[in-house]
């Protein structure tokens, strides 16, 4: 068992844990920019999925000590286009390497305040946090 | 505010919320099998990323009312190989469509038990839960 500071309200509150809920996505620390490196813009024939992909990416750490999970990783695309399946290095302009985003549920540790405003341990504030999961090789969107 | 049954311990306990911690990943409800549909094994020129991808996938809902988040989605690949960038329909055997997995932090609501074993509200049990995020077009692994 591991102990957490209580979210328990003082007497007079309903016997419930307060969990704030917001559907407003929290932006990541940095914009999930593309990060093109011609040297690493290649699809490997071994190694992890993100290096074997024809839309390769790297992961960038986003750490917040008052958030659960404390460590999140944002994908950063290494190429603007997809890498050729044949060569593993030349880019194919017919395919775009696009970031796949996801609004992940996270929890922030916040001070809780009792009825009279006095500090009552910590509460967990539930938020949606936008993370880029991977880079995906897609056909460019054709506008109608 | 959103309310959850309390993690508040009874008198005599430290004024802390108990949170169990396990690093053992929880398997998803169903194995993340491949789900090949020749009819949907094509890369669209519009629509969401998962349908424009040359490794298209669909999402399958995994709902657990005693878990946070309650709803998780598992990617299911629609093709064994990548779809040709040129045609958007024919498969290219030089590329494999592979699932990208991630161990996501989730929380389970569990009954808490007091000193004498009596029920004392709920605790949050933190677990790692394996989810498939997307299907990625990769170069097949070449064994050394």
């Amino acid at each position: 068992y591991s102990h957490w500071p209580s979210c328990c309200p003082s007497k007079g509150y309903p016997s419930e844990e307060l969990l704030r809920w917001s559907t407003v996505p929290v932006p990541p620390l940095k914009p999930a920019s593309l990060d093109f490196h011609s040297v690493s813009c290649r699809a490997s024939e071994d190694g992890p999925l993100n290096s074997r992909a024809i839309s390769p990416w790297r992961y960038e750490l986003d750490r917040d000590l008052n958030r659960l999970p404390q460590d999140l990783y944002h994908a950063r695309c290494l190429c603007p286009h997809c890498v050729s399946l044949q060569t593993g290095s030349h880019m194919d302009p017919r395919g775009n390497s696009e970031l796949l985003y996801h609004n992940q549920t996270v929890f922030y540790r916040r001070p809780c305040h009792g009825k009279k405003g006095n500090h009552k341990g910590y509460c967990l504030e539930r938020r949606l946090y936008r993370v880029s999961l991977a880079c995906v090789c897609v056909r460019p969107r054709v506008m109608g | 505010y959103s309310h959850w049954p309390s993690c508040c311990p009874s008198k005599g306990y430290p004024s802390e919320e108990l949170l169990r911690w396990s690093t053992v990943p929880v398997p998803p409800l169903k194995p993340a099998s491949l789900d090949f549909h020749s009819v949907s094994c094509r890369a669209s020129e519009d629509g969401p990323l998962n349908s424009r991808a040359i490794s298209p996938w669909r999402y399958e809902l995994d709902r657990d009312l005693n878990r946070l988040p309650q709803d998780l989605y598992h990617a299911r690949c629609l093709c064994p190989h990548c779809v040709s960038l040129q045609t958007g329909s024919h498969m290219d055997p030089r590329g494999n469509s592979e699932l990208l997995y991630h161990n996501q932090t989730v929380f389970y609501r569990r009954p808490c038990h007091g000193k004498k074993g009596n029920h004392k509200g709920y605790c949050l049990e933190r677990r790692l839960y394996r989810v498939s995020l997307a299907c990625v077009c990769v170069r097949p692994r070449v064994m050394g």
């Epitope: 992890p48 790297r58 992961y59 000590l65 999970p69 990783y73 | -």
Partner: antibody
Framework: QVQLVQSGAEVKKPGASVKVSCKAS????????MNWVRQAHGKNLEWMGL????????SHKQKFQGRVTMTVDKSISTAYMELSRLRSDDTAVYYC??????????????????WGQGTLVTVSS | DIQMTQSPSSLSASVGDRVTITCQAS??????LNWYQQKPDGTIKLLIY???TLHTGVPSRFSGSGSGTDYTLTISSLQPEDIATYYC?????????FGGGTKLEIK
Amino acid sequence: QVQLVQSGAEVKKPGASVKVSCKASGYSFTGYTMNWVRQAHGKNLEWMGLINPDNGGTSHKQKFQGRVTMTVDKSISTAYMELSRLRSDDTAVYYCAREGYYGPSPFHHYAMDYWGQGTLVTVSS
Amino acid sequence: DIQMTQSPSSLSASVGDRVTITCQASQDISNYLNWYQQKPDGTIKLLIYYTSTLHTGVPSRFSGSGSGTDYTLTISSLQPEDIATYYCQQYSKLPYTFGGGTKLEIK
């Protein structure tokens, strides 16, 4: 016991690249982040970046953007730090340091709990 | 980036003395502070993490305190083997940053 053993001293010309290795033993290599810190002669410690050996995830100081590449080889429990386009002011001792996590789960605290012996990199024409 | 200012930059004390080193952050770092010891041969060891928790094997004469932006490392009774340079480091936010160091000498 935990040990981090670094590669030997290097002498490089300006514009060249250097790759320093750090072999870990005595613990689960993929379970701990590895930091890279440098120290120019008579100067203070400067954090360069870190890498998670499990997924290759990194973070680095902005001033090293585009010049530093941190990698790992899980099969031999070794971390690498490559610095390119070397300048004379990159002359320093380069350290790898394991990042331990402490305190009440799930809100951890982080500290560089074990350090390599350091690798002197001299950049000179 | 968070700036860490350490003082004094050097100090000389006698064996048995009580020694205090201070570290000031450019913003509140919520006790997310570590202290390290660098011996003259370059060897670096973790002394204290999270402001005041002693790392395994560190003698109890070392202690840490502080909050907000101001932190202190104290050696209650200086020993000859404590000759070293001491650094504070914040881990409140990436990038991590170190103080300028305090070189401790024996009189």
